[in-house]
Amino acid sequence: ALPAKPENISCVYYYRKNLTCTWSPGKETSYTQYTVKRTYAFGEKHDNCTTNSSTSENRASCSFFLPRITIPDNYTIEVEAENGDGVIKSHMTYWRLENIAKTEPPKIFRVKPVLGIKRMIQIEWIKPELAPVSSDLKYTLRFRTVNSTSWMEVNFAKNRKDKNQTYNLTGLQPFTEYVIALRCAVKESKFWSDWSQEKMGMTEEEAPCGLELWRVLKPAEADGRRPVRLLWKKARGAPVLEKTLGYNIWYYPESNTNLTETMNTTNQQLELHLGGESFWVSMISYNSLGKSPVATLRIPAIQEKSFQCIEVMQACVAEDQLVVKWQSSALDVNTWMIEWFPDVDSEPTTLSWESVSQATNWTIQQDKLKPFWCYNISVYPMLHDKVGEPYSIQAYAKEGVPSEGPETKVENIGVKTVTITWKEIPKSERKGIICNYTIFYQAEGGKGFSKTVNSSILQYGLESLKRKTSYIVQVMASTSAGGTNGTSINFKTLSFSVFE
């Protein structure tokens, strides 16, 4: 049979290297030789390229080399397939060389901030050595912060006569390290070069961009003064590398601004002892370049009643995230403060906090929380300068099976009855929320039975046992990840009862 007609002809001019055309050869049953017929020099010259490879994949491509390549130029390319049964020709295809030229990537040699110009870096590069002299080049510059994975892109063109191979990238974050890569193409071409090697550069430092402020209210002391732990951190979106030399804090009773107290610190928290009335606390951070905007927080009076609006709250794990959702009865509340810390018996030292706006849910990556640890999560509604009553739940980012089973005892042994009691597993050993307990019991040499009860029950009465019979009993505590048995206990039912 005749060979299949070559289809899908595609050509690329790897600038000053070769012009390579490829095609789909079709299913060939016998050896097929391909000849690429070309007219070039605007139709004034023609020649052929014959595939000479024995492997079928390599036979579907052929290259023309310098100096028989001109640009600009118009080519016609036709592929002939020939086997023992005859010759078949492809459609004639037409190519403008400028439209299919592909160059080497440019080389970035410097990425630097421009003195005195904020939030900008200047990229300097060398044009690819092999690029058409007669064509303008278009560029794509892609950039990302060092700790991000998603690229942003900008496109621009450079005139071929432009000696200045630089681009000013603006609208960046201050004092942030960026990764830059550049690619180029002949302006008329559909083929982009590969990306250049990546280069790093950093924007200039600025004054700190702001703070987020929060507090932990503690019970009033005997003298009526109340300890308030102030916590703060860089505002969301602040540069990762932003430097702070220190913090200025000032506070005063709401009723009297004249009683302002001020203090400085380099820590990221501060314990204040305030009177029972309401207070305003303000603070700024500063570095060698200036001060941040002021962050302000109102501390309510001890006897002040806080509003309540969260009706229900639940936590679940979805796609590597812990998701907390709640419902609110107050439509005008759209800012919430989330606090979370591990539920350990000692005083929590690692309180984390974060605000949420325009949403009634909060997510955190599972890997930001310790697996198998119970966390206390509280959500505070915030309306203007008022902080509402929190709603708290406990949750695990990842559950495991308990590391030990319940400590079990047998009580009230009767002829046919017995009471099995067990203790809660210590918090540190639970590894998850205990959802139920299962009591396994079995008469010596007999059939085993089990009974599951919910996690609020810590004892269970077994009935209809055989008199004067040895039993083995074991209690299993289960989380969503599975269960762990406690130690097994043996007991023997009585042969008769005082009531018999």
């Epitope: 020099a41 080399f65 007669s134």
Partner: antibody, heavy 121, light 107 residues
Framework: QVQLVQSGAEVKKPGASVKVSCKAS????????MNWVRQAPGQGLEWMGL????????DYNPQFQDRVTITADESTSTAYMELSSLRSEDTAVYYC??????????????WGQGTLVTVSS | DIQMTQSPSSLSASVGDRVTITCQAS??????VAWYQQKPGKAPKLLIY???TEAQGVPSRFSGSGSGTDFTLTISSLQPEDFATYYC?????????FGGGTKVEIK
């Protein structure tokens, strides 16, 4: 800037071979064909052949086909022209010349300074 | 092979003169002709290619014309530094061939 520097003058006996080198700088060596042209004393220019350093492809003037070998070493950006079975009429200045423009292949844009080869018994 | 016939083989002219050199190809070579200038003891220098495109850095007094088989190099106003030998060359395809040269001398 683009520069082609050729090896020094040679004196050879008839029947011998000569190998002239041409070191390129200031551009991507593999991106341009390198031609060899000779000029006998008081005579015109005669094209001998070329090499494409990218793929090693050569193209020779049939007049020299049997005696000339043009090679290129990408690692040193150097082209070589070897002419064998020398006779007295091969006495000439031998030039390497880089292929020039995108829109004008086979134009000799940049030339080496020339190497005088004298064939004499 | 394509033969290139150049004329005249030499000419005398004065500074400021308009000089014309012609070259004839033995077959149609469209506009694939280049012109070179060579001074004694020096390598040739490319002036014109594609019959009429000036090479980089070449003074505008040099111009080329023609297509098919007949080509011309014109120096509109001869300068002292233009006294040299001029060669035409076809760059249609290999083998490349040159004209015999035209020596431009001071009158």
């Amino acid at each position: 800037q683009v520069q082609l520097v050729q090896s020094g003058a040679e004196v050879k006996k008839p029947g011998a071979s000569v190998k002239v080198s041409c070191k390129a700088s200031g551009y991507t060596f593999t991106g341009y064909a390198m031609n060899w042209v000779r000029q006998a004393p008081g005579q015109g220019l005669e094209w001998m052949g070329l090499i494409n350093p990218y793929n090693g492809g050569t193209d020779y003037n049939p007049q020299f086909q049997d005696r000339v070998t043009i090679t290129a070493d990408e690692s040193t950006s150097t082209a070589y022209m070897e002419l064998s079975s020398l006779r007295s009429e091969d006495t000439a200045v031998y030039y390497c010349a880089r292929d020039g423009y995108d829109d004008g292949p086979y134009t000799l844009e940049t030339w080496g300074q020339g190497t005088l080869v004298t064939v004499s018994s | 092979d394509i033969q290139m016939t150049q004329s005249p083989s030499s000419l005398s002219a004065s500074v400021g003169d308009r000089v014309t050199i012609t070259c004839q190809a033995s077959e149609d070579i469209y506009s694939f002709v280049a012109w070179y200038q060579q001074k004694p003891g020096k390598a040739p220098k490319l002036l014109i290619y594609n019959a009429q495109t000036e090479a980089q850095g070449v003074p505008s007094r040099f111009s080329g014309s023609g297509s098919g088989t007949d080509f011309t190099l014109t120096i509109s106003s001869l300068q002292p530094e233009d006294f040299a030998t001029y060669y035409c060359q076809h760059h249609y395809d290999s083998p490349l061939t040159f004209g015999g040269g035209t020596k431009v001398e001071i009158k």
